[in-house]
């Protein structure tokens, strides 16, 4: 599914992908929040920025994709497919798969989806902030 390894992507290309992911993450979170009475859980943590947070490896794309793929097993909002496709563009071909256990309890499923969706949306905000501040530093 990878046309080019991620290290061939220009910083501007990465920024476009992250901008798109930010927009999609907001859509996902908006829909997930329609399910009233579900609370965020402290049991799940989505990895976000890499230690250096520099392009091309600005975010933990393989781990984030693994979490989104887990959500995809539980939920068929088509925006999730699109998010996964965009994350694919930010992943090295040899990236190892992260294993995530799927919640089995109905309510816990909903909490997992809400928690990860919220963290993913926040993560995309952080990633974009990091990219834009990095781009500003590069031009000064």
């Amino acid at each position: 599914s990878h046309t080019l390894p991620v290290h061939f992507l220009q910083p501007s290309d990465i920024q476009k992908i992250v901008e798109e992911l930010q927009s999609l993450s907001k859509m996902l979170l908006k829909d997930v929040k329609e399910d009233k009475g579900v609370l965020v859980s402290q049991n799940y943590t989505l990895p976000c920025l890499t230690p250096d947070a520099q392009p091309p490896n600005i975010i933990h794309s393989p781990a984030i994709r693994a979490y989104l793929k887990t959500i995809r097993q539980l939920d068929n909002k088509s925006v999730i497919d699109e998010i996964i496709e965009h994350l694919d563009k930010l992943i090295f071909q040899d990236a190892p798969e992260t294993n995530i256990s799927v919640p089995t309890d109905t309510h816990e499923c909903k909490r997992f989806i809400l928690t990860i969706s919220q963290q993913f949306s926040e993560c995309m905000d952080l990633a974009l902030k990091s990219l834009t501040s990095g781009a500003q530093q590069a031009t000064t």
């Epitope: 329609e34 539980l74 088509s78």
Partner: antibody, heavy 124, light 110 residues
Framework: QSQLVESGGGRVQPGGSLRLSCAAS?????????ICWVRQAPGKGLEWIVC?????????YYAPWAKGRFTISKDNSKNTVYLQMNSLRAEDTATYFC???????????????WGQGTQVTVSS | AFQLTQSPSSLSASVGDRVTITCQAS??????LAWYQQKPGKPPKLLIY???KLASGVPSRFSGSGSGTDYTLTISSLQPEDFATYYC??????????WGFGTGTKVTVL
């Protein structure tokens, strides 16, 4: 009591067009489910046509054979989903059902809801 | 293209018999499978969803099992009102699979 009511069926000549409506009552068009059109020709099985997502984006998915001639749309203010059918052929003669399907595997059976169907006959 | 293969297409059985209907998907559908019963002139009635969950009001003689690509509907002891046509359906959604129905299994009196 949640229900779906189809209307707009009838007799139409080959090559003609028809617009079916699926009105939802007892629930609102908020996020997290799909509304689909399914048809059943006389004495035949169920055949999926198209689905539309009720959420922040009106994503649509068509059966490959339905692309081009059939178009799904929705009007949130009227809580209604439509199926526009063009260039109708004799083989489109069927009962057309609209149905609501869950978006989450964790959802309960109440998310599955079918209308009674509307009859479409394509004949000269 | 994605396909759901249901078998058998028809079967004859007697009241009290155990009946098994299978549904095979051409790719994994992660348990996004429902089973319906349909009688002439009526819309389908949900029996099983999420591959194995019994819909409310459905008798416990109906059960569903399976995962990945292979799924089964079992009627443990066929009753007179169970003579009907049964369909499996995936509601996985998304662009890679979409929705779809099995070809149906007509259960008639032996």
């Amino acid at each position: 009591q949640s229900q779906l009511v189809e209307s707009g069926g009838g007799r139409v000549q080959p090559g003609g067009s028809l617009r079916l409506s699926c009105a939802a009552s007892g629930f609102s068009f908020s996020a997290n489910y799909w509304i689909c059109w399914v048809r059943q020709a006389p004495g035949k099985g169920l055949e999926w046509i198209v689905c539309i997502y009720i959420g922040s984006r009106a994503d649509t998915y068509y059966a490959p054979w339905a692309k081009g001639r059939f178009t799904i749309s929705k009007d949130n203010s009227k809580n209604t989903v439509y199926l526009q059918m063009n260039s109708l052929r004799a083989e489109d003669t069927a009962t057309y059902f609209c149905a609501r399907f869950s978006s989450g595997i964790y959802d309960l059976d109440r998310f599955f809801l079918w209308g009674q169907g509307t009859q479409v006959t394509v004949s000269s | 293209a994605f396909q759901l293969t249901q078998s058998p297409s028809s079967l004859s059985a007697s009241v009290g018999d155990r009946v098994t209907i299978t549904c095979q998907a051409s790719q994994s559908i992660d348990s996004w499978l429902a089973w319906y019963q349909q009688k002439p002139g009526k819309p389908p009635k949900l029996l099983i969803y999420q591959a194995s969950k019994l819909a409310s009001g459905v008798p416990s003689r109906f059960s569903g099992s399976g995962s990945g690509t292979d799924y089964t509907l079992t009627i443990s002891s066929l009753q007179p009102e169970d003579f009907a046509t049964y369909y499996c359906q995936t509601y996985y959604g998304g662009g890679h699979i979409g929705w779809g129905f099995g070809t149906g299994t007509k259960v008639t009196v032996l």
